[in-house]
Amino acid sequence: FKVATPYSLYVCPEGQNVTLTCRLLGPVDKGHDVTFYKTWYRSSRGEVQTCSERRPIRQLTFQDLHLHHGGHQAAQTSHDLAQRHGLESASDHHGNFSITMRNLTLLDSGLYCCLVVEIRHHHSEHRVHGAMELQVQTGKDAPSNCVVYPSSSQDSEQIT
C-alpha cells in the first residue's frame, strides 16, 4: 500500500482553520492479524529521510495523536486532549485520514507528516509516511482563506 498526500503545500492566513489530509492507497489487507496504526507529527527534511524526526504538534506527541483500528474502520483520537490544543485527527472508511488545526498561528508553520504502520502480527511492521508543508501568513500578503497546492502540480485551489 502507499500513502498519498493530495496537497503538498497549504498556505493559510493566521486565525484560520486547516485540515491536512493523507490517503491510504492500494490493496489493504483486512485480515484478522493485520491492523493499522496512524498518527501525525511535525518533522524536518532530515538527513536520513523526510519525516524520520518526530516533533510534537502544539505540544502533543505522535502518541497523543494516534488512531488505532483494523483495516479501513473509522477512528478518532482522544477528543479531550486534542481539542484542548485546537486539534482533531480522524479517519474514515475509505482510507482518508486527517488532522484539523484550529486558529492557526505563525508558530504552526512547518513540515507535517502522517505515518501509517501496517502491523502484520507474526511478521513485521510496514511504515509509510506522507509529508506536507504548512505556511501560515499574516499581514496584507496573506490569503483570505487557505490556498492548497496539489502534490502532482503547482495549480492552486482555494479552500473556503
Partner: antibody
Amino acid sequence: QVQLQESGPGLVKPSETLSLTCTVSGGSISSYYWSWIRQPPGKGLEWIGYIYYSGSTNYNPSLKSRVTISVDTSKSQFSLKLSSVTAADTAVYYCARDIPAFAFDIWGQGTMVIVSS
Amino acid sequence: EIVLTQSPATLSLSPGERATLSCRASQSVNYYLAWYQQKPGQAPRLLIYDAFNRATGIPARFSGSGSGTDFTLTISSLEPEDFAVYYCQQRISWPLTFGGGTKVEIK
C-alpha cells in the same frame, strides 16, 4: 502519566507455570502493544512477546510453545503465563508498553522470579 | 532472527570523556534501531529511537547514528550518572531482539 506495575509470585517450582500480571495505570490499555521482556541475572534482555490492544498476540519463537499472554481491558491488566518452567527461566520479568514503529517507552520496575524446588 | 552484536563488552572511561558504543546487526534493520540505558536494579530507559532521534527528556550529550547494519551511540562528555549498561534493539522484524549490552564503567 502511564505507569506499569508487575505482580505475581517470586518463587515457582520447576515444571510448574509462572503467572504474572501487569497493571496499567494513568492511561488507556486500548491501544499499543503490551509486552513482556525478561532478563536472567547478570545477562541481557529477551523479548518474550506482546498482546496488541485488539487481542492479537505475537511470541518469541524460542518460547512460543510455553507462552500465553492475555489482556483484561476492564481491569487495565495484561498477563503472562509461562508453562513447564526450569531454572533457566529464573529472571527479572518486565512488562512494557511498545508503540508501533517506535520503541519500548514505558517499563514496569520488574519483578524477580526464581524457579527452584 | 536478527542478531545484534554490541562492542566493546566493557568500556572503561573517566567522567568528561567521550564514549562511543557500537551495535552491528546480522542483516539490515534500515534505521529501525533503539538504544536503552539500564542502571543496576532499574528497568531500562529509552534513549534513542529510529537510530538517531532522542527520546523525550534525554540530554543532548546522547546522540545516535548509523543505518543498515552498523550503528553508534555516542555520549559526548560522560556525566557520573551515565555509567550504566547500554542495549541496542531492532524493530524491523519479529522477534524483537536486543544486543548483549555494553557496560560503561568508571576508569
